[in-house]
Amino acid sequence: QRDFFTPNLFLKQMLERYQNNSPPNNDDQWKNNGVTKTWDRLMLQDNCCGVNGPSDWQKYTSAFRTENNDADYPWPRQCCVMNNLKEPLNLEACKLGVPGFYHNQGCYELISGPMNRHAWG
C-alpha cells in the first residue's frame, strides 16, 4: 500500500495542522508546531509552495486561512522568493502573485520522488 505517499495525505495534514493555533489539546499543539516548522523549512529550502502549488492555500478550507487575512496572506510568506536575508524579495508582488516573486511549484513533486525511491528501492 502506497497511500502514505499520496499528495492527498500530505495536503490533509498541511491544511489541518499548518499554523493551527487552536487545537483541542496540548499534544495536538505540539504536533501542529512541528508540522508548521517542517513545512516552513521545506518551502524555504526547496523553493516550493504547498503540496500541489500556491492554489492549495486558496482552494481549500485550512487552519492557515482561518488564522490569516486573504489580502495579507494569500499563501504563507515562505512561498515568496526570498533575498539572502530570508526576507521576501518583494512582498507586495508576492502577495499579488507576480511571476518571479513567489514559488509556483508544489512541494509534493520535489519530495515524493526521493521518498518513493527510499520506500520502494
Epitope: N84, L85, E87, N90, L91, E92, A93
Partner: antibody, heavy 123, light 107 residues
Framework: EVQLVESGGGLVQPKGSLKLSCAAS????????MNWVRQAPGKGLEWVAR??????????YYADSVKDRFTISRDDSESMLYLQMNNLKTEDTAMYYC??????????????WGQGTLVTVSA | DIQMTQTTSSLSASLGDRVTISCRAS??????LNWYQQKPDGTVKLLIY???RLHSGVPSRFSGSGSGTDYSLTISNLEQEDIATYFC?????????FGSGTKLEIK
C-alpha cells in the same frame, strides 16, 4: 548620477533630540531599501538602521545600540530619508551617512554613500 | 552578531606594488562579503560586493577573493589615489557588521 545629501547634524546635549535628513536623487528612490551608517571619530563604520520599500511594508531594522531611541523613516514622494534620534548619548557622537542598499537577491551591500553629517553629543 | 576582524590596522606599500588586505568573519558568511574604500576626506565608496564582484566604475586593479570565513582584497598595481582606509563588511545576516579597517599608506 546617484546623489545622497545629508543634513541636520550639529551639537546637541545628552538626552536631547535631533532629526537627520537625506535628500536622494538620480535613482528610483521608492524601490530601494535605505540605511544609516555611522562612524565615531577615529573609529570604524557601524550600521545603524534600515528601512525597506513600500512594497515591503516599510519594514524597519535597528542596531541594538540605538533600538527604542532612533526611528528611521522615509517620504517616497519627496525622495527623502530621515533618522529621528532621541535620548542621545555621548557615544552617539559620529559622522552619519545616508546609504542606498544594493538590490536583487543579495541585498546586504551598500552601493552608494552620502558625504555624511556630523552629530556631536556633548554637555 | 557576526564579528569581522581585520588584523592589519595599517599597511605601508610602494606605488606599483601588489597589496593584499585580509578580513575574517567569526562564522561562515557564504561569500556575502563587501569591501569599501574611505578616503582621508571621509568619502566612502563601494569597491567589491559578494566577495569578488566589481562595483560599477571601480578600476580593474581591485579584486576580491575568499570563501567561508576568510576573505581578501587585492590591489594589483598600487596608485597614489588608492591611499585610503579599507573596510570589509558582511551582508549575510542582520545586523550588518564591518571590520575595523586597514589604513593603506605609501612607503
Amino acid at each position: 548620477e546617484v546623489q545622497l545629501v545629508e543634513s541636520g547634524g550639529g551639537l546637541v546635549q545628552p538626552k536631547g533630540s535631533l532629526k537627520l535628513s537625506c535628500a536622494a536623487s538620480g535613482f528610483s528612490f521608492n524601490t530601494y531599501a535605505m540605511n544609516w551608517v555611522r562612524q565615531a571619530p577615529g573609529k570604524g563604520l557601524e550600521w545603524v538602521a534600515r528601512i525597506r520599500s513600500k512594497s515591503n511594508n516599510y519594514a524597519t531594522y535597528y542596531a541594538d545600540s540605538v533600538k527604542d531611541r532612533f526611528t528611521i523613516s522615509r517620504d517616497d514622494s519627496e525622495s527623502m530619508l530621515y533618522l529621528q534620534m532621541n535620548n542621545l548619548k555621548t557615544e552617539d557622537t559620529a559622522m552619519y551617512y545616508c546609504v542606498r542598499q544594493g538590490d536583487g537577491y543579495y541585498v546586504g551591500w551598500f552601493a552608494y554613500w552620502g558625504q555624511g553629517t556630523l552629530v556631536t553629543v556633548s554637555a | 552578531d557576526i564579528q569581522m576582524t581585520q588584523t592589519t590596522s595599517s599597511l605601508s606599500a610602494s606605488l606599483g606594488d601588489r597589496v593584499t588586505i585580509s578580513c575574517r568573519a567569526s562564522q561562515d558568511i557564504s561569500n556575502y562579503l563587501n569591501w569599501y574604500q574611505q578616503k582621508p576626506d571621509g568619502t566612502v565608496k563601494l569597491l567589491i560586493y559578494y566577495t569578488s564582484r566589481l562595483h560599477s566604475g571601480v578600476p580593474s586593479r581591485f579584486s576580491g577573493s575568499g570563501s567561508g570565513t576568510d576573505y581578501s582584497l587585492t590591489i594589483s598595481n598600487l596608485e597614489q589615489e588608492d591611499i585610503a582606509t579599507y573596510f570589509c563588511q558582511q551582508g549575510n545576516t542582520l545586523p550588518f557588521t564591518f571590520g575595523s579597517g586597514t589604513k593603506l599608506e605609501i612607503k
